[in-house]
Interface confidence: low
C-alpha cells in the first residue's frame, strides 16, 4: 500500500447550522477519519474509516453554536482484516497524515437559508408582512430552536418592496420578523426579503426569498 494522500480543500458547508465538512481527493488505498474538538478540547472521531469525502458534523457543532470548533481529516492506510469483513486503522504508533480544517464558529460562519414570506396581514391602512421564523438544527431541551431563538436581536431582515406596477423600490431593515407599510387602496405590493446577521463581517446576508405579491387590495371602504 502506498502512502496515504493528505486531504486538501477542506471546506465547511453550513446552512442554518446543518454543517458538513467537505474535502478532496477521493481516496484510493486508504480511508479518512474526521476528528472534531469539543469544548473540553478533546478530539472526537466522526465518519470513522470512510471512503467519502464529506462528513456531517451537525450533531457536534449544534451543542454550542458560539464555540469555535477545530476539525481535522486523517488519511488512514487500510488493509484487509483477518476476517476480511472490514478495515482496520494501521497507525504503527504514529498519527496518520492529517490536514486541519479552518476553524468553524457556527454562530458566525453558518450561512443563512433562504427566508420565506409567511403571510400578509391587513390592519387598517397598514399592511403587515410576516417572515417565517424557520427552524434550525440547534436543540434545547429536546426541541429545535428557530433562527430568532438562536440569534436574538442580532438577526434582522432586509425587506425590499415596490408597488406591483412600479419599478421604483424601497428598502427597510427590521430586527423582528414583521414589517409594516402604509398601503394605498386598490394597489398590489411585491416583497423580497433577505435575512442578515448584524454582527457578522462576512456571510452577513442570506439568499433572497422568492418575490411575493399581494392581491389587489379591496377598497378600504368595503365597496
Amino acid at each position: 500500500a502506498g502512502i496515504p494522500e493528505k486531504a486538501f480543500n477542506l471546506t465547511w458547508i453550513s446552512t442554518d447550522f446543518k454543517t458538513i465538512l467537505e474535502w478532496q481527493p477521493k481516496p484510493t488505498n486508504y480511508t479518512y477519519t474526521v476528528q472534531i474538538s469539543d469544548r473540553s478540547r478533546n478530539w472526537k472521531n466522526k465518519c470513522f474509516s470512510t471512503t467519502d469525502t464529506e462528513c456531517d458534523l451537525t450533531d457536534e457543532i449544534v451543542k454550542d453554536v458560539t464555540w469555535a470548533y477545530e476539525a481535522k481529516v486523517l488519511s488512514v492506510p487500510r488493509r484487509n482484516s483477518v476476517h476480511g469483513d472490514g478495515d482496520q486503522l494501521v497507525i504503527h504508533g504514529e498519527e496518520p497524515p492529517f490536514t486541519n480544517a479552518p476553524k468553524f464558529l457556527p454562530y458566525r460562519d453558518t450561512n443563512l437559508g433562504q427566508p420565506v414570506i409567511q403571510q400578509f396581514e391587513q390592519d387598517g391602512r397598514k399592511l403587515n408582512v410576516v417572515v417565517k421564523d424557520s427552524l434550525t438544527l440547534v436543540r434545547k431541551n429536546g426541541t429545535f430552536l428557530t433562527l430568532r431563538q438562536v440569534f436574538g436581536k442580532d438577526l434582522g431582515y432586509i425587506i425590499t418592496y415596490r408597488k406591483g406596477s412600479s419599478t421604483g423600490k424601497k428598502t427597510n431593515i427590521t430586527n423582528t420578523n414583521e414589517f409594516s407599510i402604509d398601503v394605498e387602496e386598490g394597489v398590489s405590493y411585491c416583497f423580497f426579503v433577505q435575512a442578515m446577521i448584524f454582527s457578522r463581517k462576512t456571510n452577513q446576508n442570506s439568499p433572497g426569498s422568492s418575490t411575493v405579491c399581494t392581491e389587489q387590495w379591496k377598497s378600504f371602504l368595503g365597496e
Epitope: 458560539t66 464555540w67 469555535a68 476553524k103 464558529l105 454562530y107 458566525r108 434545547k140 436574538g152 436581536k153 442580532d154 454582527s199 463581517k201
Partner: antibody, heavy 116, light 106 residues
C-alpha cells in the same frame, strides 16, 4: 438608551465571598452580558459572558473556575461572584452589553478592594 | 488565539491627526472594535466592526482594518480626546483586548 447599573464598591478580606450585580434597563434576556476586569493601572481583560435568557455562560480560560457568572432574568440582573477572594482580585469590574467582540454599553463599574 | 499589540503611547498636537495601531496575526479577517477610556470613567465604544461609529461618537473618529493591522484615526484631535484607547476582537470563542494606548494631546 440602554443603561446598566452596577452595585456599589466593596471592601473585603481575603477568603471572603462576594457577589456583585449589574441591572439592565432594557430587554435584558435577549442580549448577552459580558464582564471585564481592570486591575489598578492596567488594561481591560475579558472575563466571560452570560446569555440571561437561558443562563448559558462562557468564561475566559484565565477566569474559568475563579469566578461564577449568573443571572436572574426576572429582575434583569446579572451577577459576578467569588467564593474565596484573594488580594489579586482587587480591581474595577465592569459589566457591558456584549456581542462577540463588541461591548456597546457599559456599566459604571464596581470597585472591589481585597485587603487584610 | 490571536494576540493584539498596541503602542503604549501616542502623542499628537491639537488639530492634528492621531493614529493608533493594533496588530495581530491576520487581524484583517476579524472584526475589531475600539474603546476610549478617560481617567475614572468606564470605557466607551467609539468604533465597531472595523469602521462603524456608534451614534453620538464624533465624525473625527474612524477606523480601518486590513492585513495584520487595525488603525484608529482621530482627525482634528481635540484636548478632550486625551484618553486610553483599547482595541478588541473575538477569536476562538474568546474576546481579546489589546494592551491599550495612552493618547496625549500636547
Amino acid at each position: 438608551q440602554v443603561q446598566l447599573v452596577q452595585s456599589g464598591a466593596e471592601v473585603k478580606k481575603p477568603g471572603e465571598s462576594l457577589k456583585i450585580s449589574c441591572k439592565g434597563s432594557y430587554s435584558f434576556t435577549s442580549n448577552w452580558i459580558g464582564w471585564v476586569r481592570q486591575m489598578p493601572g492596567k488594561g481591560l481583560e475579558w472575563m466571560g459572558w452570560i446569555y440571561p435568557s437561558d443562563s448559558m455562560t462562557r468564561y475566559s480560560p484565565s477566569f474559568q473556575g475563579q469566578v461564577t457568572i449568573s443571572a436572574d432574568k426576572s429582575i434583569s440582573t446579572a451577577y459576578l461572584q467569588w467564593s474565596s477572594l484573594k488580594a489579586s482580585d482587587t480591581a474595577m469590574y465592569y459589566c457591558a452589553r456584549y456581542l462577540f467582540g463588541l461591548f456597546d454599553n457599559w456599566g459604571q463599574g464596581t470597585l472591589v478592594t481585597v485587603s487584610s | 488565539d490571536i494576540e493584539l499589540t498596541q503602542p503604549p503611547s501616542v502623542s499628537v498636537a491639537p488639530g492634528q491627526t492621531a493614529r493608533i495601531s493594533c496588530s495581530g496575526d491576520n487581524l484583517g479577517s476579524y472584526y475589531v472594535s475600539w474603546y476610549q477610556q478617560k481617567p475614572g470613567q468606564a470605557p466607551v465604544l467609539v468604533i465597531y466592526n472595523d469602521n462603524n461609529r456608534p451614534s453620538g461618537i464624533p465624525e473625527r473618529f474612524s477606523g480601518s482594518n486590513s492585513g495584520n493591522t487595525a488603525t484608529l484615526t482621530i482627525s482634528g484631535t481635540q484636548a478632550e480626546d486625551e484618553a486610553d484607547y483599547y482595541c478588541a476582537t473575538y477569536d476562538s470563542s474568546t474576546d481579546v483586548f489589546g494592551g491599550g494606548t495612552k493618547l496625549t494631546v500636547l
